[in-house]
Structure formats: structure tokens, C-alpha cells
């Protein structure tokens, strides 16, 4: 009966709704933030354009041992088509600046609130 | 306090070009749409286009679309609507309004809830 | 285009009485994301327009809640519950779904 329980779990999720929840997630981490979002950790900007999710996620995934940024971390792998590990590093990162985790968030959510009004959910 | 203040009223001749600005103040312009709006004497509104100030990528009704650029320069907060080739039914009573997003709700987009005070534009030979 | 219509053109009412504005796209306005991006301004005599309501029926801050919206698909309804003197001018009903985002040609309501 477990294993037929598998064949009720819901297809892959549309683009928009995944969008929706990646910026509901961000949400809930600017709303719930009282100390300094992973203990004020700095990243790599990064500029937002195409190849930004995985620019992004090669950004925040050199921050270890912030749990509050996991399951961003993770929603972000699910728009990056390849895999992201700590290190790595593509030409959309601003090298030479280096942001606080809370702005970059900031930035992102503003980002892709836009990409939502506009319908870019890809 | 949010504000939008325009530039002063144009006399303009056919054929000519004038720039409209829309200073900002109480808010960063890169959170926002920033929009154009027209309405000629006695009539209703035109939405003319938007701009998104973070990256400079512009909308524009397919009418409007060569004659007018609009621009934004996050440095001083400013947007501009510069429409060209003038006639006198370009005649009219410009706006600039905003599209703010906020941090606090996955879903805000407030539509434009603030407006400049308008700028008279008027083309006669 | 999406062209919006308003009805009626002209709206003479009572103060204290009720009033309604009906606005009619020409085609669906859900947006993309499943929004739709319907709004209502108000342009009160030599002023600039203001918003009362975006998103089909939220209500903007600081308008009063004898101001409400509804409606989906093509067909939209501004309500005023009680009309006072200040609620003259013009009310337009704009799409921002769809580029050219579009208004609708406008309501003008007078006091009897």
C-alpha cells in the first residue's frame, strides 16, 4: 500500500506555483528575521539576469550552518539544471562585491517578484 | 513621504520632441515600475508605457512605440518620458505614477498608487 | 488591445444612496500567475488619479470601505455603499494584465 501511494503524489509543479513558493519562502525569511540573518555572513552579488537561480544558489550555498536559508538553498537547486557545489562560481557573480545574506535576499525577492508581475517563471 | 514631482508645463512646436521628468522622493525607484499616463483635454486616461529602474527594460503601447522612450537613472531618483515627431494631438496633461513592491508579502504589487501632479504638454505651431 | 467598457458613462446619485460601476473587458484578464490585474481610479476634478482598488477587490490604504470591487473573467463591479458629496469625478477601471495595459473610457459620478 506504500509503494501504491506513489502513483497518487502530484506531477512536477507548474513554473509559476515553484515561483510563487521560492518568493513566499524569501518572504518569510525577511519577515522572520530578528538577529542578523546567518549571523550577517557575506556572498557574492550577483547580476539578475538569465542564469541568475543558479548564480544565486552558487552564492548562498558557500554559507554553511544557516538554517534558515536551507530550504531556499534547496528550492533554488530545483531551478538550477545542473548540480551546484560549494566553490563553484559563474561569470554572473559581481567578484569584486560582496553583500551581507539579508540584502542579497532582499535583492533576489524583489527580482523575482518582478519576474512573477511579468510572467517569466522559467 | 512619497512623492512624485514633475517638471513644468511645455509649449511645443509639431514635429518637435519634449522630455517629461518624475523626481522621486520617499522610496527607492529601483523597487518600483514607474509609469506614463496621459490625458488629452476632456478625455479619459492613456496608459502610455513603464520602465523597471533595477535593469531599464521598458513597455510600451504598440501606438507610442518609436516615438517615445522612457528612461530611468536610479542615481537621482529620477524617471523621464520623452516623446518625439510632436502633433497637436499629443496635446495633453502627462502623469507619472509607480508600481511599488514591498519586502512583507508574497504578492504585492500595489498597482499605481502614487501619481505625479501632472505636466501640460501642448503642441502648436 | 483589450478594450475596457464602462457603464453608465454618467452616474447621477444621492447623497446617502448606493451607487454601482460596471467595467467589461473584451477578452479574459487573468494574468499569467493567475492574477487579475484589475484596478479603479478615481480622478476627482483637477486633481490627479488616485487608486481605490487593485487586484479585482483589494482596497487601497486609506480608502474607505463604502468602496468595494468584484467580479472575474471579463465582467467587474465598483460598489459605493453610501455615496457622500466627495465621492465626485471620474472613475476608470484599468487592466494591467495584458500588454497595452488599458483603461476604460470613464464613469462620471455627480450628486443629484
Known amino acids: 500500500l506504500t509503494c501504491l501511494g506513489g502513483f497518487a503524489s502530484p506531477g512536477p509543479v507548474p513554473p509559476s506555483t515553484a515561483l510563487r513558493e521560492l518568493i513566499e519562502e524569501l518572504v518569510n525569511i525577511t519577515q522572520n528575521q530578528k538577529a542578523p540573518l546567518c549571523n550577517g555572513s557575506m556572498v557574492w552579488s550577483i547580476n539578475l539576469t538569465a542564469g541568475m537561480y543558479c548564480a544565486a544558489l552558487e552564492s548562498l550555498i558557500n554559507v554553511s550552518g544557516c538554517s534558515a536559508i536551507e530550504k531556499t538553498q534547496r528550492m533554488l537547486s530545483g531551478f538550477c539544471p545542473h548540480k551546484v557545489s560549494a566553490g563553484q562560481f559563474s561569470s554572473l557573480h559581481v567578484r569584486d562585491t560582496k553583500i551581507e545574506v539579508a540584502q542579497f535576499v532582499k535583492d533576489l525577492l524583489l527580482h523575482l517578484k518582478k519576474l512573477f508581475r511579468e510572467g517569466q517563471f522559467n | 513621504q512619497v512623492q512624485l514631482v514633475q517638471s513644468g508645463a511645455e509649449v511645443k512646436k509639431p514635429g518637435s520632441s519634449v522630455k517629461v521628468s518624475c523626481k522621486a522622493s520617499?522610496?527607492?525607484?529601483?523597487?518600483?515600475?514607474m509609469h506614463w499616463v496621459r490625458q488629452a483635454p476632456g478625455q479619459g486616461l492613456e496608459w502610455m508605457g513603464t520602465?523597471?529602474?533595477?535593469?531599464?527594460?521598458?513597455k510600451y503601447v504598440p501606438k507610442f512605440q518609436g516615438r517615445v522612450t522612457i528612461t530611468a537613472d536610479e542615481s537621482t531618483s529620477t524617471a523621464y518620458m520623452e516623446l518625439s515627431s510632436l502633433r497637436s494631438e499629443d496635446t495633453a496633461v502627462y502623469y507619472c505614477?509607480?508600481?511599488?513592491?514591498?519586502?512583507?508579502?508574497?504578492?504585492?504589487?500595489?498597482?499605481?498608487?502614487?501619481w505625479g501632479q501632472g505636466t501640460l504638454v501642448t503642441v502648436s505651431s | 488591445d483589450i478594450v475596457m467598457t464602462q457603464s453608465p458613462l454618467s452616474l447621477p446619485v444621492t447623497p446617502g444612496e448606493p451607487a454601482s460601476i460596471s467595467c467589461r473587458s473584451s477578452?479574459?484578464?487573468?494574468?499569467?500567475?493567475?492574477?487579475?490585474?484589475l484596478e479603479w481610479y478615481l480622478q476627482k476634478p483637477g486633481q490627479s488619479p488616485r487608486l481605490l482598488i487593485y487586484?479585482?477587490?483589494d482596497r487601497f490604504s486609506g480608502v474607505p470601505d463604502r468602496f468595494s470591487g468584484s467580479g472575474s473573467g471579463t465582467d467587474f463591479t465598483l460598489k459605493i455603499s453610501r455615496v457622500e458629496a466627495d465621492d465626485v469625478g471620474i472613475y476608470y477601471c484599468?487592466?494591467?494584465?495584458?500588454?497595452?495595459?488599458?483603461f476604460g473610457q470613464g464613469t462620471k459620478l455627480e450628486i443629484k
Open positions: 505614477a509607480r508600481s511599488i513592491f514591498d519586502d512583507y508579502h508574497y504578492d504585492d504589487y500595489y498597482a499605481m498608487d502614487y
Open positions: 520617499g522610496f527607492y525607484i529601483k523597487d518600483t515600475y
Open positions: 520602465i523597471d529602474p533595477a535593469n531599464g527594460n521598458t
Open positions: 477578452q479574459n484578464i487573468v494574468h499569467i500567475n493567475g492574477n487579475t490585474y
Open positions: 487586484k479585482i477587490s
Open positions: 484599468f487592466q494591467g494584465s495584458h500588454v497595452p495595459w488599458t
